[in-house]
């Protein structure tokens, strides 16, 4: 199996994780995509997914997770707002392509959320932001459940994350409707 690497992000409660997952737009523009958490000893759980087929730039919100798939750019943006300590964990973007297995990202995100004041931007934070609003109208998509995983041999797209601090406090509901998805590595 391909060795998966990960990047560590240490953020404070209340901050926002902002991940950009690149993909080959000609192949995957309209494919359904998902954001998963991987806990030790467990299969990955899909926390949120885009619609099927994925709609261009149309935000999908599940609790405090917002997905935006930009077909024109080959980029899936994932935001987790108002981070809580219990959000700490290992995350990844995947691209669904049934009947084949999902394409997984090599660069997983190791998120560590700590308690503390997040009013002053830290070294990894975005201090140039002057407008940051959660879209008022979003769609929640149903995520598929895969049951026959095989080894992924082709390199999938990559992802990175940055962090930003909203101008105003964001209070959204916790993530709901978590769906189990088997490991694909």
């Amino acid at each position: 199996a391909t060795k998966l690497t990960e990047e560590k992000y240490e953020l404070k409660e209340g901050q926002t994780l902002d991940v950009k997952c690149d993909y080959t737009l000609e192949k995957f523009a309209s494919s359904q995509k998902a954001w998963q958490i991987i806990r030790d000893g467990e299969m990955p759980k899909t926390l949120a997914c885009t619609e099927r087929p994925s709609k261009n730039s149309h935000p999908v919100q599940v609790g405090r997770i917002i997905l935006e798939d930009y077909h024109d750019h080959g980029l899936l943006r994932v935001r987790m707002v108002n981070l809580q300590v219990e959000d700490s964990g290992l995350y990844q973007c995947v691209i669904y392509q049934p009947p084949k297995e999902p394409h997984m990202l090599f660069d997983r995100i190791r998120l560590v959320v700590t308690k503390g004041f997040s009013g002053t931007p830290g070294s990894n934070e975005n201090s140039t932001q002057n407008v940051y609003k959660i879209p008022p109208t979003t769609t929640k998509a149903l995520c598929p459940l895969y049951t026959s995983p095989r080894t992924v041999t082709q390199a999938p797209p990559k992802s990175t994350a940055d962090v930003s601090t909203p101008d105003s406090e964001i209070n959204l509901t916790n993530v709901t409707d978590i769906i189990r998805v088997p490991v694909f590595n």
Epitope: D72, H73, A161
Partner: antibody
């Protein structure tokens, strides 16, 4: 075919103002982040500002914050950059670009010269 | 701010030869890195994004690799139309930042 056509550049004195415009066609403007990137004569590329399709997120480089304002009119497929309190170091070709993080399509640019 | 450093500043290569350009980030940008080509008097053109994904319509002789802080851009066999200035750009964090550019010139 994607087309981005900038206008509004010209010669202005230090402390003066200019408003750049960009007419977009060939793609769904209202679904795309848009940005401005500039290039001083004989120099490299510098990102200036980015704006989300619905205006809910706007970002600026520190050197222009408080002086420049990016805006858009999705009904008219147009992007704007209001530049106030211009300085000599703002002299550059200003490009209108499609994208908010990386830039898939570029206009041909409009030259802004700040000089007394 | 993430500082992007490109090397060499100028690269002299003969047509048909391979050109290898380097880009280094002051901190990890994972794979959120793009490469652009700019010919004299023209606007830049996106060649590579996601460190290694070719943009639409870009010939296979252009390729990118790397992740984290070290990236490489390669033109496998230089054509006459490839002589230009090449820029890398990170889009992991705002402010978005470009490298200073590498000029690929005819040897």
């Amino acid at each position: 075919e994607v087309q981005l056509v900038e206008s509004g550049g010209g010669l202005v004195q230090p402390g003066g103002s200019l408003r750049l415009s960009c007419a977009a066609s060939g793609f769904t403007f209202s679904s795309n982040w848009m940005s401005w990137v500039r290039q001083a004569p004989g120099k490299g590329l510098d990102w200036v500002a980015s704006m989300k399709q619905d205006g809910s997120e706007i970002y600026y480089v520190d050197s222009v914050k408080g002086r420049f304002t990016i805006s858009r009119d999705n009904a008219k497929n147009s992007l704007h950059l209001q530049m106030n309190s211009l300085r000599a170091e703002d002299t550059a070709v200003y490009y209108c670009v499609r994208g908010g993080w990386r830039f898939e399509s570029w206009g041909q640019g409009t030259l802004v010269t700040v000089s007394s | 701010e993430i500082v992007m450093t490109q090397s060499p500043a100028t690269l002299s290569v003969s047509p048909g030869e391979r050109a290898t350009l380097s880009c280094r980030a002051s901190q990890s940008v994972s794979s959120n890195l793009a490469w652009y080509q700019q010919k004299s008097g023209q606007a830049p053109r996106l060649l590579i994004y996601g460190a290694s994904i070719r943009a639409t319509g870009i010939p296979a002789r252009f390729s990118g690799s790397g992740s984290g802080t070290e990236f490489t851009f390669t033109i496998s066999s230089l054509q006459s139309e490839d002589f230009a200035v090449y820029y890398c750009q990170q889009y992991k964090n705002f402010p978005l930042t470009f490298g200073g550019g590498t000029k690929v010139e005819i040897k």
